[in-house]
Each structure stands twice: as C-alpha cells, then as structure tokens.
C-alpha cells in the first residue's frame, strides 16, 4: 500500500514539476527590468527565452521574438537546450511511469517489469529536474554577471549633461517557477526510485508443491532469491499454513512484500 502511495505521489509530484518546467520555459519573465533606480518607470522591460517584451504604463504590451539563431548568446542557446531536454525527458518519463503505476493493470505485466519501468521513469525525472535546475541557474548566473557589469557602466554621459541610463535586468518570475518545478521533478523522480525498491518482487514465483502429510495438510512454497539489484532486503522462506490440502493449480500466489510495508 505504501509503495503504491509512494509511486502515485512520485508520479503526481513529477507531473506538477514537468508542467512547471514547461510553464517556465514558455514564460516571458525570465529577466525583468530592475526598478531600483526608477520605481515609477512608464516603460517596463522583460525578457524570456524566446522573445522580449515591453509593457507601457498605458497598458500596451509589445513582444518581439528572437528571429535569429546565430545572433543569440551561446548561454541563452544552452539554457534553451537544457530546458527542452528537461521537458522531453520528463514527458517520456511521464509516459513510462503511467504504465509503471501499480494501480493500472496492463495485461499480465509482471511486477519486475513495473519495477524496472518505475526505476527508468524515476531516473528520467531526476535528470529532467536537474536539467531544469541547471538551465535556470545558468540563466540566473548570466543575469547576475550582466547586472554587475551594467551597474559598473550605469551612466554614460556627454560632459555630465546628458544621462543615458542602461537598463539593468534582475530575476524574473520564470526563474523561481523553474527552480521550484525542477526541484519537484527531482523529488518525484527520487520517490519513483524509492517505490521501485518496494515494487521489485522478493521471490521468484515457482509453482508450489503439495506435500500430503498424514496429519494435517501443509502447503509449502520454497522462497526464491531475487536477482541482486541492490533494492531487495534479505529474503526469507515463507510458509502458508492451510486447513486442507490443495492441488498444484489451486495454490494461490502469495502476497508480495509491498503489501505488508
């Protein structure tokens, strides 16, 4: 039950995280004009990964796309790439994790297959989250560098008579959305990996052999050892005591470890 909950929660957290990464990637407010020197500006500038916008106090907003690839800074291209890779990995991870969910039955999919898929999606979510966090952090670092550079050259004037104020940019809302979303995706991925441990079957399901003793019938099931994945705890042989004898075909599959967690 707890494994199912962990897996489900991991999936939901990752889903929210990936939705956030997509939202952050599409948002225009990656960097916003620093209003420290002029808090009552009539023109407010902000920039995204794909376009830059200007909002006038009149209410008019004008956005212009970056219609060049070669003319864009390499760092911006790198951030775009990281965010897109994060989205793609996250989307694939979501697709895989849907089939891996314990609450969803697809044919006669083995628990081991579901465990592997859960692990795969978990790793994908972790990498996706790391890509988003890295992308946002690279952009933030770029902003900090430019901020201090523009502060150093804040005013350039002609004989001190005419002031040309350089527009400085600071962290936009998208950065915080990206950091939070990346973190959630990462947490979701970790949860999926934890759930994988519990999903992995503890023993190989051999057919049970019935031993007909003279007194009362006891059905034994030998405990098989799981392949060493590093996720299982020490397995123990389990006995099921039954009131009457059962044939081979009547022997039911035994509860897995995760049902007792």
């Amino acid at each position: 039950m707890a494994v199912t909950a962990c897996q489900g929660l991991g999936f939901v957290v990752s889903l929210i995280g990936i939705a956030g990464i997509i939202a952050a990637t599409c948002m225009d407010q990656w960097s916003t004009q620093d209003l420290y020197n002029n808090p009552v500006t009539a023109v407010f500038n902000y920039q995204g990964l794909w376009r830059s916008c200007v909002r006038e106090s009149s209410g008019f907003t004008e956005c212009r796309g970056y219609f060049t690839l070669l003319g864009l800074p390499a760092m911006l291209q790198a951030v775009r790439a990281l965010m897109i890779v994060g989205i793609v990995l996250g989307a694939i991870g979501l697709l895989v994790s849907i089939f891996a969910l314990k609450c969803i039955r697809i044919g006669s999919m083995e628990d081991s297959a579901k465990a592997n898929m859960t692990l795969t999606s978990g790793i994908m979510f972790i990498v996706s989250g790391l890509c988003a966090i890295a992308g946002v952090s690279v952009f933030a670092n770029m902003l900090v560098t430019n901020f201090w550079m523009s502060t150093a050259n804040m005013y350039t004037g002609m004989g001190g008579m005419v002031q040309t104020v350089q527009t400085r940019y600071t962290f936009g809302a998208a950065l915080f959305v990206g950091w939070v979303a990346g973190g959630l995706t990462l947490i979701g991925g970790v949860m999926m990996c934890i759930a994988c441990r519990g999903l992995a079957p503890e023993e190989t399901n051999y057919k049970a052999v019935s031993y007909h003793a003279s007194g009362h019938s006891v059905a034994y099931k030998p405990g098989g050892f799981k392949a060493s994945t590093g996720f299982g705890s020490n397995t123990k042989n389990k006995k099921i005591y039954d009131g009457g004898a059962r044939t081979e075909d009547e022997v039911q599959s035994y509860p897995s470890k995760h049902d007792y967690v």
Epitope: T41, V43, S57, V165
Partner: antibody
C-alpha cells in the same frame, strides 16, 4: 466617438477643497489608464496624476502629492480628482486625458478652470 | 525628473515653407527593450486642448497629415512640417513618455509672417 467632459471647476479659496469629475463616453473606460494634466500660461502643460485601468498603480506629480487624490468609477465611466489644501499655484485649466500607445495622450477633454484666490 | 527643452520658442513662417523644431531631453528616451524612443508631439490651437500628432518619436497618429514628420533618437528630436498650412499655426509641445513624472517642453509657437 471618444468624448471626455470635465466638470467641477470654479473659484476656490486658498486652503480649500474641490472635486473635479471627468465623464467618459465612446470607449471602454475600464480598459484605459487615465490622467489629469493642467495648464497655465506661465508653466505650460504640467502632468498632475495617473490612475491605471484597474485603479492600481496610481502616480502623482511631486507638486500635488499628499494633497490631490485621483480615483475612478469604472461602472459609471467617471474619473475624479479630489483636490485639498489648494494653493494659488494650483490655479490652472485642468484636463483629463486618455492614455494611449507610446504612453501618449490621444484624447483630451475641453478642460475645466480652477481658480484659487482669496 | 526628465527635463524637456524645446527650441526655438517662436517660429515665424510663410505658407508652404518647410519648418523644423527641436526638442531635447535631459535623459535618453530610447528604450533598449524595443528600441523605441518614448517621445510624443502635440499640437495645441488657442482655446482647444492639445491634439496628439506623433508618438514613439516618429509614429504618426491616425488622421494626422503626412506633412508632419517626427525624427530623432536618444535625447535629440525634431518635428518637421514639410509644407506649412494656415491651419498648422499653433503651439507644439514635446513630451517625455519614458518615465514618471511625464514632463512637457515649454512649447514652440508657429506664427505666420
């Protein structure tokens, strides 16, 4: 057709109060920022106050800050300017204007004259 | 505050003549975000409110005759009337539309010889 009609002007004693109104028609009033601008032969055109379409933010000229209050009633398509502690230098023709592209004023009212005198 | 300086204060012209008036700002009105200059020109005739002529330094308002042209960038701007008509005789104001407080120039009065 866009129309802005100011009212409420007149003779006021120094230290007195006055409330100006601007009735708007011919456009979606709630969708535009609005301004009060005044004009005197000595000072020319002087921007007084601004109120955004949703009533926030609001900005004032330093000369009127703390004495004048701009407000709007979107359902009634009306802009207001409450003036208190009036001084002789507040004597002017007061215009209301609509904010437009490029932070320009595309439509102005005919103005209402406020005279502050003993 | 951005100070707007207009020159000359008076311009005496004859009908059909080309005329230019200047407006200088104490601070650049060029916005780096969209490369637009936030300067506006108005025309005011006696007993009337100002009328918008040009915004973004060079964009003509609809209905404004094409003999009116705005130009310039940064801190230096010009309004040109290619062929002055009798109805163009008025006061012309430039306005800082870049930051609050929105400030106006003292105006240039266009008069007939």
């Amino acid at each position: 057709d866009v129309q802005l009609v100011e009212s409420g002007g007149g003779l006021v004693q120094p230290g007195g109060s006055r409330k100006l109104s601007c009735a708007a028609s011919g456009f979606t009033f709630s969708g535009f920022g609005m301004h009060w601008i005044r004009q005197t032969p000595e000072k020319g055109l002087e921007w007084v106050a601004y109120i955004s379409s949703g009533s926030r933010p609001i900005y004032y000229a330093d000369t009127v800050k703390g004495r004048f209050t701009i407000s709007r009633d979107n359902p009634k398509n009306t802009l207001f300017l409450q003036m208190t502690s009036l001084r002789s230098e507040d004597t002017a023709m007061y215009f209301c204007a609509r904010f437009y592209y490029g932070n320009s004023f595309d439509h102005w009212g005919q103005g209402t004259l406020v005279t502050v005198s003993a | 505050d951005i100070v707007m300086t207009q020159s000359p204060s008076f311009l005496t012209v004859t009908a059909g003549e080309k005329v230019t008036m200047s407006c200088k700002s104490s601070q650049s009105l060029l916005n780096s975000g969209n490369q637009r200059n936030y300067l506006t020109w108005y025309q005011q005739k006696p007993g009337q409110p100002p009328k918008l002529l040009i915004y973004w330094a060079s964009t003509r308002e609809s209905g404004v005759p094409d003999r009116f042209t705005g130009s310039g960038s940064g801190t230096d701007f010009t309004l040109t009337v290619s062929s002055v008509q009798a109805e163009d005789l008025a006061l012309y104001y430039c306005q800082n539309a870049y930051s609050f407080p929105l400030t106006f120039g003292a105006g240039t009065k266009l008069e007939l010889k």
